[in-house]
C-alpha cells in the first residue's frame, strides 16, 4: 500500500531572464527512493539516481542545474517555460509518486520600465 505524499512548491512565478528552484519532498513513507525524474510534458529534463547522481537531458543542459537536494534549478527563464512540471519519485517497494508544479514566467518589470528610471 502506498502511504507516501508529495509536497511541492505548488504554483510559482518568476521573472523572465531569472531563475527558479523546483522542489518536491516525499514524506509519510519508509520506501527507498531509487530515482527522481523531472519532467515537462513529454520532455525529460533530468534524472537524479540515488546511486549514480544526476543526468541532465542534453536539450536542457545549458539552462538546467541539479539541486539543491533532489530539486532542480531552471535558469535564463523565458515565457515559453510557463507550464506544468512534474517530479516523479521512483521508490521501492511502493512504486511511483508524482508531484506537480505550475510555473508562470512573467515579463520582467525591470525590463518593461527600466528606461523610465534615470540616475540623477
Amino acid at each position: 500500500m502506498m502511504t507516501g505524499t508529495i509536497e511541492t512548491t505548488g504554483n510559482i512565478s518568476a521573472e523572465k531572464g531569472g531563475s527558479i528552484i523546483l522542489q518536491c519532498h516525499l514524506s509519510s513513507t519508509t520506501a527507498q527512493v531509487t530515482q527522481v525524474n523531472w519532467e515537462q510534458q513529454d520532455q525529460l529534463l533530468a534524472i537524479c539516481n540515488a546511486d549514480l547522481g544526476w543526468h541532465i537531458s542534453p536539450s536542457f543542459k545549458d539552462r538546467v542545474a541539479p539541486g539543491p537536494g533532489l530539486g532542480l534549478t531552471l535558469q535564463s527563464l523565458t515565457v515559453n517555460d510557463t507550464g506544468e512540471y512534474f517530479c516523479i519519485y521512483h521508490t521501492y517497494p511502493d512504486g511511483t509518486y508524482t508531484g506537480r508544479i505550475f510555473l508562470e514566467v512573467l515579463e520582467s518589470s525591470v525590463a518593461e520600465h527600466g528606461a523610465r528610471f534615470q540616475i540623477p
Partner: antibody
C-alpha cells in the same frame, strides 16, 4: 581509451555459481557505473545490474536473489556471481561502462562478451 | 518492467536506400531511449542517446526521433557496413530494458 575484458569459465554445471570478472583499463572504476548485461541465445539483451563509483549496487529484480556484483579497486576490476544457475542462464555475458552524467542509462563502452553455457 | 517492442524483426535494404526501425515502449518513457548497433561477431555499440542525440563518431546518416512511447531510428542511406542488429533501450526507470532487436541486411 576505455577497455573492458571479461574472463571466467565457459561451462558451469546446473545449481552451481557462475563467476565472471571484468578487467578495466584506461579508466578508474571509482568513476561512473560498471554493469553486467547478458544475452541468452535468440533472446533480448537483459541488464543484470551495476556497481556504482561509490560501490553501491543495484540488481535487476528478476535476478536479485541470485546476483552479487563486487569490485576490487586495487586491481581495477569488478565481478559477477550468479548462484543456482540453470540452463536458462546460458548466455553471452557482457561487462559494460555507463557514464550516467553524460548519457543517462545508455551504455557507452562494452566488453567483447564471453559465452557461458550451463550444462552437466 | 517496461517492455520495448521493435519492428520489423528484419529488414533487407538496397545500398543507398533509407531504412527505418520502430521501437514502442509499454509506457511513457519521455526521451530516455538509446539505440545500439551490433555488427556480426562484435559487442553492441552506442549510436543514439536521449532519443535523438548521436553518440561521438556516429555518422550523420543515422538519426533518432520520438518521445513518449514511439521511437524511430532512421538510416538515410544504408551502406554495406551498416549490416547488423539494432537494439533500442529505455532508461526512464530501472530495470533498464532492451528491445528484441532488428536485423538489417543488404540486398
Amino acid at each position: 581509451e576505455v577497455q573492458l575484458q571479461e574472463s571466467g569459465p565457459g561451462l558451469v554445471k546446473p545449481s552451481e555459481t557462475l563467476s565472471l570478472t571484468c578487467a578495466v583499463s584506461g579508466y578508474s572504476i571509482t568513476s561512473d557505473s560498471w554493469n553486467w548485461i547478458r544475452q541468452p541465445p535468440g533472446k533480448k539483451l537483459e541488464w543484470i545490474g551495476y556497481i556504482s563509483y561509490s560501490g553501491n549496487t543495484y540488481y535487476n529484480p528478476s535476478l536479485k536473489s541470485r546476483v552479487t556484483i563486487s569490485r576490487d579497486t586495487s586491481k581495477n576490476q569488478f565481478s559477477l556471481k550468479l548462484s543456482s544457475v540453470t540452463a536458462a542462464d546460458t548466455a553471452v555475458y557482457y561487462c559494460a561502462r555507463l557514464d550516467f552524467s553524460n548519457y543517462g542509462g545508455a551504455v557507452d563502452y562494452w566488453g567483447q562478451g564471453t559465452t557461458v553455457t550451463v550444462s552437466s | 518492467d517496461i517492455v520495448m517492442t521493435q519492428t520489423p524483426l528484419s529488414l533487407s535494404v538496397t545500398p543507398g536506400q533509407p531504412a527505418s526501425i520502430s521501437c514502442k515502449a509499454s509506457q511513457n518513457v519521455r526521451t530516455a531511449v538509446a539505440w545500439y548497433q551490433q555488427k556480426p561477431g562484435q559487442s553492441p555499440q552506442l549510436m543514439i542517446y536521449s532519443a535523438s542525440y548521436r553518440y561521438t563518431g556516429v555518422p550523420d546518416r543515422f538519426s533518432g526521433s520520438g518521445s513518449g512511447t514511439d521511437f524511430t531510428l532512421k538510416i538515410s542511406r544504408v551502406e554495406a557496413e551498416d549490416v547488423g542488429v539494432y537494439y533500442c533501450q529505455q532508461y526512464y526507470t530501472t530495470p533498464w530494458t532492451f528491445g528484441g532487436g532488428t536485423k538489417v541486411e543488404i540486398k
